[in-house]
Interface confidence: medium
Amino acid sequence: MRTEAQVPALQPPEPGLEGAMGHRTLVLPWVLLTLCVTAGTPEVWVQVRMEATELSSFTIRCGFLGSGSISLVTVSWGGPNGAGGTTLAVLHPERGIRQWAPARQARWETQSSISLILEGSGASSPCANTTFCCKFASFPEGSWEACGSLPPSSDPGLSAPPTPAPILRADLAGILGVSGVLLFGCVYLLHLLRRHKHRPAPRLQPSRTSPQAPRARAWAPSQASQAALHVPYATINTSCRPATLDTAHPHGGPSWWASLPTHAAHRPQGPAAWASTPIPARGSFVSVENGLYAQAGERPPHTGPGLTLFPDPRGPRAMEGPLGVR
């Protein structure tokens, strides 16, 4: 588990200071301003290594280069959502980590990077286009994913491209939705600021409204839009996967998994208790994700020897700066 670097919660002025309308007018610009300021092009990086052990393990490392707070990370094998893939692990900053064979020892490395050890024994089927993908759901950026295909063949007889071609993409819904909201928000913010200039400041007067109502209302649009942007994080894989993934997940999985487009053989049956776990009512993107994960319950990570390729006591450092060599 790790401590999560959350986006600072926007504290609206106390409702007692002005009416509900005035409250909305003051809070919304701040929400939109935060979204505008934090809007950037986040990137996700993926690195896969073969561990130098007789067990032939693979280590997948992924990181998110964005300013938002990460609410969910999903690692899959076999391709991105569009191409189909099989989920290997889901990591949540608060609710914990779930992993499925042949994944072993998924963990947070830093607040914005994760690592996952994969048992190589399961990866016994040959495949020239095996792809590992990492998807980061974050607020306010939305959902971002990067995939890396295994070192391609330079053999003209094989169909792989001659140079590594990383897939770095945001989900269309995330791009269009968040970008649209941000664009509209920034324009609306300017409009509000202009209008605010040309009108007298509201008089401070006690509000007759319940203190809770305006707060919930102020966040409601954010919750709705982010819930609409939410995409399933499990992916299906029809082309190439390790042999052990053809077996059912031994430890069960989240009850919400059944509703996601996973391979039929990979829909684990979770205990009924998971379904009864209430979704937290906090109106933020992180809360929506937490709710989904709360249903999933937690499973202790696979035990086994911690295989480290690098004796360096510092361990792999988190990626800094742009992709590639600094």
Epitope: Q47, R49, E54, G148, P151, S153
Partner: antibody
Framework: EVQLVQSGAEVKKPGSSVKVSCKAS????????ISWVRQAPGQGLEWMGG????????NYAQKFQGRVTITADKSTSTAYMELSSLRSEDTAVYYC?????????????????????WGQGTTVTVSS | DVVMTQSPLSLPVTPGEPASISCRSS???????????LDWYLQKPGQSPQLLIY???NRASGVPDRFSGSGSGTDFTLKISRVEAEDVGVYYC??????????FGGGTKVEIK
């Protein structure tokens, strides 16, 4: 202990081809990258290409592109390197070596970021 | 392509004395993961090369602790704290970061004075 055993010495005519084998015993074969490195008489080491048997993907140094073919047979834990259109300057000792690989989404990949097990070498002489 | 330059070409050494070999890369070998993708190999006379140091500073299994690797980016050094007679041979550095493939240095021949 892992060992890589290579096929015996070869004498070839210019223009012909040579196929050198490299059989792994005593350890994992298919998950590692197998690289081929050659050393001309009195010269240094030169990487020719490599393959990751488990994925069947091969990659070659630009210098040898189109002339070298690297394959692997997982069932026999054997890798092969075939060099065609031989010339006298291809006379060298050819080594196979095993090592772990990596790749990442920024476009870096290596067919062995180090080579911890080496074959004994196969001498190929190209002479008319 | 990345060019690896080793110096000196030849290094006469006295047993028990320290020795140092330099390797310079035309491009940085420091990956964003914090590791330098540089290895050191020793090829003893009439033998296959053997791995000494990997990822810049990590000693390979079975390598005596008198061997150490250091450096970062483009400049690297292999040090032998006390040379022994069995250490003679040609030492090669190798980069494994920049594709296509890996690139070896020209080699440094270590011989007893």
């Amino acid at each position: 202990e892992v060992q890589l055993v290579q096929s015996g010495a070869e004498v070839k005519k210019p223009g012909s081809s040579v196929k050198v084998s490299c059989k792994a015993s005593g350890g994992t074969f298919s998950s590692y990258a197998i690289s081929w490195v050659r050393q001309a008489p009195g010269q240094g080491l030169e990487w020719m290409g490599g393959i990751i048997p488990i994925f069947g993907t091969a990659n070659y140094a630009q210098k040898f592109q189109g002339r070298v073919t690297i394959t692997a047979d997982k069932s026999t834990s054997t890798a092969y390197m075939e060099l065609s259109s031989l010339r006298s300057e291809d006379t060298a000792v050819y080594y196979c070596a095993r090592g772990p690989w990596y790749y990442d989404s920024s476009g870096y990949s290596s067919y062995a970021y180090y080579m911890d097990v080496w074959g004994q070498g196969t001498t190929v002489t190209v002479s008319s | 392509d990345v060019v690896m330059t080793q110096s000196p070409l030849s290094l006469p050494v006295t047993p028990g004395e320290p020795a140092s070999i330099s390797c310079r890369s035309s491009q940085s070998l420091l990956h964003s993961d914090g590791y330098n993708y540089l290895d050191w190999y020793l090829q003893k006379p009439g033998q296959s090369p053997q791995l000494l140091i990997y990822l810049g500073s990590n000693r390979a299994s079975g390598v005596p602790d008198r061997f150490s690797g250091s450096g970062s980016g483009t400049d690297f050094t292999l040090k032998i704290s006390r040379v022994e007679a069995e250490d003679v041979g040609v030492y090669y550095c190798m980069q494994a970061l920049h594709t296509p493939g890996v690139t070896f240095g020209g080699g440094t021949k270590v011989e007893i004075k």
